[in-house]
Each structure stands twice: as C-alpha cells, then as structure tokens.
C-alpha cells in the first residue's frame, strides 16, 4: 500500500533572468527512493538514479544544476520556462509517486513593480 | 477504474479529414495527465501522434506536419482528433491512451480501425 | 527525433526457456524507456518503465535494465500466455517513439 505523501513547495514565482531551487520531500513511508525524475509534461529535465548518479537533458545542460539534495535547480530563467514542472519518485516497494510545482517567471519591472504596492 | 473508448468512422476517402473520439469513463480529463493519440498501421509499429494535456495545451508529432489536430470537450469528458489530407498511408488502428507519469501508456482504449480507401 | 532499434525482429523459443529482447536508442536516454506486450487484435500492455521498474500488476518474470543507449526486456522463463509482440518506447521527450516490435513465437 502506498502510504506516503509528496511535499513540494506549490506555486512559485521567480525574476526572469534569475534562478529557482525546484524541491520535493517524500514523506510518511519507509519506502526506498531509487530513482528521482524531474519533467514537464513533454520533456524529461533531469533524473537522479541512486546508482548512476545525475542525468541532465541536453537541452537544459547549460541552466541546470542536480541539487540540492533530489532537488533541481534552474538559472538563466525566461519567461519560456513558466509551466508546470513534476517530481516523479521511484520507490520500493511503493512504487511511484509524483509532485507538482507551478512556476511562473515574471518580467523583471513586473516582479520590482509588484514589490511596491 | 479508468476506461478509455475510441469511436468515429471505420472508412474515410482520400484527401478527406479522419475524425475520431476517445470516451473517457472512470477519471476526469480536466483533472491530470494528458491523453494521447497513437496509431498502428496493420501488421507495423506504433507511432504516437500527440496528446491535449489536462491543462489544454496540445502536443504533435512532427512528422505528421500541420495535419493533425487534437482538441478535447470537457462537458462530454471526450477528446478527439482530426488528421486532414489522409491518404491510403494513414489506415490504421487508432488508439487513445493516457499518458502517466513518467510518460508511459498504461491506460489504452482497445482501438479502432480507420481504413482510407475510395 | 529519437529513433529506438529493437533486436531481434523475431524470436522463436520454447516455454520455458529464458529470453532477452533488445533496444538501442539513437541518443542517450538516461533511463527513461518502456516496454509493451502486445497481443493480436489487442492494444498493447504496459510491462516495464524507467527502464526496470515493473509496472503494476506484471509478474516478476518480466524484468528490464539498461541505461543511456542501451535497454534488455528479459523474461525469466516463458509461459504459453507470453508469446506476443513486445515494444520499446522511450518516454525521455516529445515525439514518443517505439521500436519496431519483436514478434516471440513458440518454436
């Protein structure tokens, strides 16, 4: 039976041109992670396999970093980069469970514009 | 339990437009996941054509060009998809399935066959 | 896109016996592969996903390994009811492709 739960960090926001840590915490099981996806709905970004360590996609080598932790995260954003994002935990015996977070990237006068009012 | 139920015309002419429907029962479309297109010319392989997110955004196979069109209509928990310009090349059977996550098919509706023919 | 390779195209083998079907991808995947049975007249079956991980339901004959460019579907010891047309698919990026099926026939 699949006991646990997946903790992200919801709906964020960050600066284009700017960076964000993408972190999800499994919790409530004793279950084993061995594999940790990290995708948007048509692209895999990343994987941390216990064995095999980080793999990330091509086309996000240059803004990427594993960490921290199963976490990831993305530098350089644009406002391209605002969607969904999921955290997919490969775990025994469970099986898999999935997270999700919401990035919106905002215009740098939008996000200095919001910090005045 | 999640089903999935393919249904439209089993023959289309030439330079004419397939439409199908895939029925979802047992799962909201609008809720997760995205639901996907796949085909299967008889006796050959699988070829993915696309899906409509939960969200309502579309992806498309390339290769299939501007040709296909995956829309969805959440009153009648249905998507559907139309490939326009068919030729004899297009007959196949057509699935629908969800995609899960990570992006494999466990869910399949059992097909339906669309033969383009005059 | 990325193209997926399968070997052999057929495969003749007796109940029993143990088999492994292959998958080359044209770039590295990372784990990211899933395997399929398929049954004439049938939509296929999900089998196998990241590559190892056993999908729910399938009995533990079945397993899969491999990573970056290289994937193995082996059944351990063969029963009546597996003799089918297996796929690989990879689930890294949009376009989803699939091999082009290994047909398992009884010898």
């Known amino acids: 039976m699949m006991t646990g739960t997946i903790e992200t960090t919801g709906n964020i926001s960050a600066e284009k041109g700017g960076s964000i840590i993408l972190q999800c915490h499994l919790s409530s099981t004793t279950a084993q992670v061995t594999q940790v996806n990290w995708e948007q709905q048509d692209q895999l970004l990343a994987i941390c396999n216990a064995d095999l360590g980080w793999h990330i996609s091509p086309s996000f080598k240059d803004r990427v970093a594993p960490g921290p932790g199963l976490g990831l995260t993305l530098q350089s954003l644009t406002v391209n980069d605002t969607g969904e994002y999921f955290c997919i935990y490969h775990t025994y015996p469970d099986g898999t469970y999935t997270g999700r977070i919401f990035l919106e990237v905002l215009e740098s006068s939008v996000a200095e514009h919001g910090a005045r009012f | 339990q999640v089903q999935l139920q393919e249904s439209g015309p089993g023959l289309v002419k030439p330079s004419q437009t397939l439409s199908l429907t895939c029925t979802v029962t047992g799962y909201s479309i609008t809720s997760d996941y995205a639901w996907n297109w796949i085909r299967q010319p008889p006796g050959k392989g699988l070829e993915w054509m696309g899906y409509i997110s939960y969200s309502g955004s579309a992806r498309y196979n390339p290769s299939l060009k501007s040709r296909v069109t995956i829309s969805r209509d959440t009153s009648k928990n249905q998507f559907s998809l139309k490939l326009s310009s068919v030729t004899a090349a297009d007959t196949a059977v057509y699935y629908c399935?969800?995609?899960?996550?990570?992006?494999?098919?466990?869910?399949w509706g059992q097909g339906t066959l669309v033969t383009v023919s005059s | 896109d990325i193209q997926m390779t399968q070997s052999p195209s057929s495969l003749s083998a007796s109940v029993g016996d143990r088999v492994s079907i292959t998958c080359k991808a044209s770039?590295?995947?990372?784990?990211?592969v899933a395997w399929y049975q398929q049954k004439p007249g049938q939509a296929p079956r999900l089998l196998i996903y990241?590559?190892?991980y056993r999908y729910t339901g399938v009995p533990d004959r079945f397993s899969g390994s491999g990573s970056g460019t290289d994937f193995t579907l082996t059944i351990s010891s063969l029963q009546p009811e597996d003799f089918a047309t297996y796929y690989c698919q990879h689930h890294y990026s949009t376009p989803y492709t699939f091999g082009q099926g290994t047909k398992l026939e009884i010898k």
């Open positions: 770039q590295d995947v990372s784990t990211a």
């Open positions: 399935a969800r995609k899960g996550y990570p992006a494999y098919f466990a869910y």
């Open positions: 990241s590559a190892s």
